[in-house]
Interface confidence: low
Amino acid sequence: GQFRVIGPRHPIRALVGDEVELPCRISPGKNATGMEVGWYRPPFSRVVHLYRNGKDQDGDQAPEYRGRTELLKDAIGEGKVTLRIRNVRFSDEGGFTCFFRDHSYQEEAAMELKVEDPFYWVSPG
């Protein structure tokens, strides 16, 4: 059956060195355990994280994300997943695309990550 993919409608903010979570879901909600789920970075489609055949496909990851990502699948039975990125870098700022593929049917959603410097502050008046 058909579905649409929904990501955050507002940019998600994170501090350098922190971890960040990028949520994504399908609507109507349904079990996505058997689907291929992933995140990539446009415009060059560098793979951030890929889940296929019931497991994470670490070998397909872009080197800059290896060991830094985790797919939170607690609610995958309802079609909801979250990508956790650890040790956020300035280079992570920008667009991400989440996708769900069920056999030949694929939908995706774009989202944006804003990365901020934890040591930048403005002195009061």
């Epitope: 649409r4 990501g7 409608r9 507002h10 940019p11 998600i12 949520p23 609507s27 109507p28 909600g29």
Partner: antibody, heavy 122, light 107 residues
């Protein structure tokens, strides 16, 4: 139990200002986007504005853009709607509503306040 | 803006009747549709979201279907407490828009 209680409605003259408040309880207020929806007497529902969980992003209906400002104070669990340059056509019951999801796209509303009536008349 | 058109605007029905309300979007909205029930002097109550998902605590006699531009809310066996006004709402794109409402009255 989730509760949303709106206050601040009343009678105001055209061109005047009013600030609505919505006190929230029974859920993690700082995790959810919130909206204002209004209903003119005897009419249907009209979405007015919404704000994301942190207050960093806001959206408005064209009919109120530039006149209304939505804001929130997560420390006080309170949502606000500052209404300026009020017009007769702004007369309505204003509902505060909780978005179903936290920071996810797709605003629909699982909890609503009882509403507060704003009457704009000279 | 996406225009949501409900039909009929009002209907009369008896307890036990099967009632169907339709909602049409002016452009495709996938399954990004919610249905609400509103009684006089009260706030709306969420019944259905994602076009067909039943909100927790809502009786199973309510069901939703459709995708794209055409959607349906069905009450399989109308109960006395179901006499109210029903609204559809799209949340596919800003601004979120509602249908004009369908009033279900006692025959």
């Amino acid at each position: 139990e989730v509760q949303l209680v709106e206050t601040g409605g009343g009678l105001v003259q055209p061109g005047g200002s009013l600030r609505l408040s919505c006190a929230a309880s029974g859920f993690t207020f700082s995790s959810y986007a919130m909206s204002w929806v209004r209903q003119a007497p005897g009419k249907g529902l009209e979405w007015v504005s919404d704000i994301n969980h942190s207050g960093g992003s806001t959206y408005y209906a064209d009919s109120v853009k530039g006149r209304f400002t939505i804001s929130r104070d997560n420390s006080k669990h309170t949502l606000y709607l500052q209404m300026n340059s009020l017009r007769a056509e702004d007369t309505a019951v204003y509902y505060c509503a909780k978005d179903y999801y936290d920071i996810l796209t797709g605003s629909f509303f699982d909890y609503w306040g009882q509403g507060t009536l704003v009457t704009v008349s000279s | 803006d996406i225009v949501m058109t409900q039909s009929p605007s009002s209907l009369s029905a008896s307890v036990g009747d099967r009632v169907t309300i339709t909602c049409r979007a002016s452009q495709g909205i996938s399954s990004a549709l919610a249905w609400y029930q509103q009684k006089p002097g009260k706030a709306p109550k969420l019944l259905i979201y994602d076009a067909s998902s039943l909100e927790s605590g809502v009786p199973s006699r309510f069901s939703g279907s459709g995708s794209g531009t055409d959607f349906t809310l069905t009450i399989s066996s109308l109960q006395p407490e179901d006499f109210a006004t029903y609204y559809c709402q799209q949340f596919n794109s800003y601004p979120w828009t509602f249908g004009q409402g369908t009033k279900v009255e006692i025959k």
